[in-house]
Amino acid sequence: QGCGEDKICQSNLQLVRARFCTRVSDTEFQPLPMDVDGTTALFALSGQPVIGLELMVTNLPSDPAQPQADGDDAHEAQLLVMLPDSLHYSGVRALDPAEKPLCLSNENASHVECELGNPMKRGAQVTFYLILSTSGISIETTELEVELLLATISEQELHPVSARARVFIELPLSIAGMAIPQQLFFSGVVRGERAMQSERDVGSKVKYEVTVSNQGQSLRTLGSAFLNIMWPHEIANGKWLLYPMQVELEGGQGPGQKGLCSPRPNILHLDVDSRDR
Amino acid sequence: ELEPPEQQEPGERQEPSMSWWPVSSAEKKKNITLDCARGTANCVVFSCPLYSFDRAAVLHVWGRLWNSTFLEEYSAVKSLEVIVRANITVKSSIKNLMLRDASTVIPVMVYLDPMAVVAE
């Protein structure tokens, strides 16, 4: 039954979708962004305890014009899942509870077998999500590759398929800046560089504050970070534009310390107006 | 990648009233942006190592507008926008490190002073 007139069950199981997702809620998943190659997902290692793998399996005729050629019932239809060391099987979810397959894993949760139906009927389509624990991912992990193989005792040649994601460590740093004040004014008379003794001789004062915040782990484990400010010190013809008087980093060194930045500002050694600090 | 400078929004903060400007308002048409990314200014990059950067850091930079340059070059200009840019860079042996939103643009508007004295 369900095997056509020739009584030979020629199924056409196809894994039409295998893509990594972020888990938004218990049964809501969002596909990960894709790399430029269009086939590799991008997984940001930033505290996501699990990753979803969306799987869609169909059993449809390969040629709608010849529906009897294949697409018969797939008996003992299964999906075999081989996980890398960095991922472990945690559970299965489906948008439609009726479509949720029974999935069993081995002891170390590295192999999973999902029962898709016995049989998986002609014309059937099933979508479900494997929930995979990311606890095994380390900063050395650069790629996730899950091998997937459909299996059935019906007549069909089946080949393994891989779902891939490139792992990157996204530093949760945010940066914002402001100028104090936001508007400046110029006036008076032209004076040469040599006539400048004090910073007050130069022109209107301005202070920039650039704040960097790190929402994640300490950067010490990842490398060395630098905060850079592109300071427009001269116009295109080489005349002074913004004269840098003082550059200080607060909070990147240790309690109460003021960090040193390079190069040193105030190259004309003008007298500092202490009232401005 | 550096983001484009913030644009002045129409009908928002206007430049001071033009009645005191020594040149006619017809001449005072230009709005100039001084920005190293556009090649209209030259920049020195101050780089500050974040040695023990666990939560936050603030870079404080004090400067002075070089009055004489503006008087010589821009006294007939309606307004100038001076752009300062800042970013974070990370040096690491880890190949798959990625920074998002790691740059910011800080614009300042500059005008000829109606009071005709250098602000102190």
């Epitope: 402001m178 104090i180 004040p181 936001q182 508007q183 109460g256 009232r275 | 929004e9 903060r13 936050a56």
Partner: antibody
Framework: EVQLVESGGGLVKPGGSLRLSCAAS????????MNWVRQAPGKGLEWVSS????????YYADSLKGRFTISRDNAKNSLYLQMNSLRAEDTAVYYC????????????WGQGTMVTVSS | SSELTQDPAVSVALGQTVRITCQGD??????ASWYQQKPGQAPVLVIY???NRPSGIPDRFSGSSSGNTASLTITGAQAEDEADFYC???????????FGGGTKLTVLG
């Protein structure tokens, strides 16, 4: 939920001292410049003091003449205001407020704590 | 020290447009921020920077600036907008913050 909660207010005699606290939660406290602002009964808002992220830059309203000291403990997510030589005119609701990174604006305020200076 | 001057009181008919102004020398250099305060409550930021609204603030609130005057405009005032409004900016030293005296907005009708 991002919030600031002030405490430590109360009734104090002229010349006395009081220490106000502000407990921050729901955000990375050590990333923000913090401020105290006060409001006398029936009057307007008056800025009191500000402190930068690790306390290197501290400013006070001129009218306070060294009687108040602002401090912070980032490990405890707390802001403090030590008020000495209190006067009747210091009677006010004292608010702590967080300053936005990219603008001179106080985007999060506490509910305030009342300080009454009276004999 | 700089001062910011506001009208003590302003009234507007329900659904009409009202403008609250703030004057001060420091506003030539600094953008004003605007706060709404209802009786017995803490102030709430409504406008900051050029004309930025924090999330949750209705778009009937807008800000603008010209010369030494900053303005807060409420287009189509609602009964719930009745409150005290304060402007603030840095003072000319750049290190201190100064508040305006406040404007009591009454919504009529």
């Amino acid at each position: 939920e991002v919030q600031l909660v002030e405490s430590g207010g109360g009734l104090v005699k002229p010349g006395g001292s009081l220490r106000l606290s502000c407990a921050a939660s729901g955000f990375t406290f050590s990333s923000y410049t913090m401020n105290w602002v006060r409001q006398a009964p029936g009057k307007g808002l008056e800025w009191v003091s500000s402190i930068s992220i690790v306390g290197n830059y501290i400013y006070y309203a001129d009218s306070l003449k060294g009687r108040f000291t602002i401090s912070r403990d980032n490990a405890k997510n707390s802001l403090y205001l030590q008020m000495n030589s209190l006067r009747a005119e210091d009677t006010a609701v004292y608010y702590c407020a967080r300053r936005k990174w990219e603008h001179d604006a106080f985007d999060i305020w506490g509910q305030g704590t009342m300080v009454t200076v009276s004999s | 020290s700089s001062e910011l001057t506001q009208d003590p009181a302003v009234s507007v008919a329900l659904g009409q447009t009202v403008r609250i102004t703030c004057q001060g020398d420091s506003l030539r250099s600094y953008y004003a921020s605007w706060y709404q305060q209802k009786p017995g409550q803490a102030p709430v930021l409504v406008i900051y920077g050029k004309n930025n609204r924090p999330s949750g603030i209705p778009d009937r609130f807008s800000g603008s600036s010209s010369g030494n005057t900053a303005s807060l405009t409420i287009t189509g005032a609602q009964a719930e907008d009745e409150a005290d409004f304060y402007c603030t900016s840095r003072d000319n030293s750049g290190n201190h913050v100064v508040f305006g005296g406040g404007t009591k907005l009454t919504v009529l009708g």
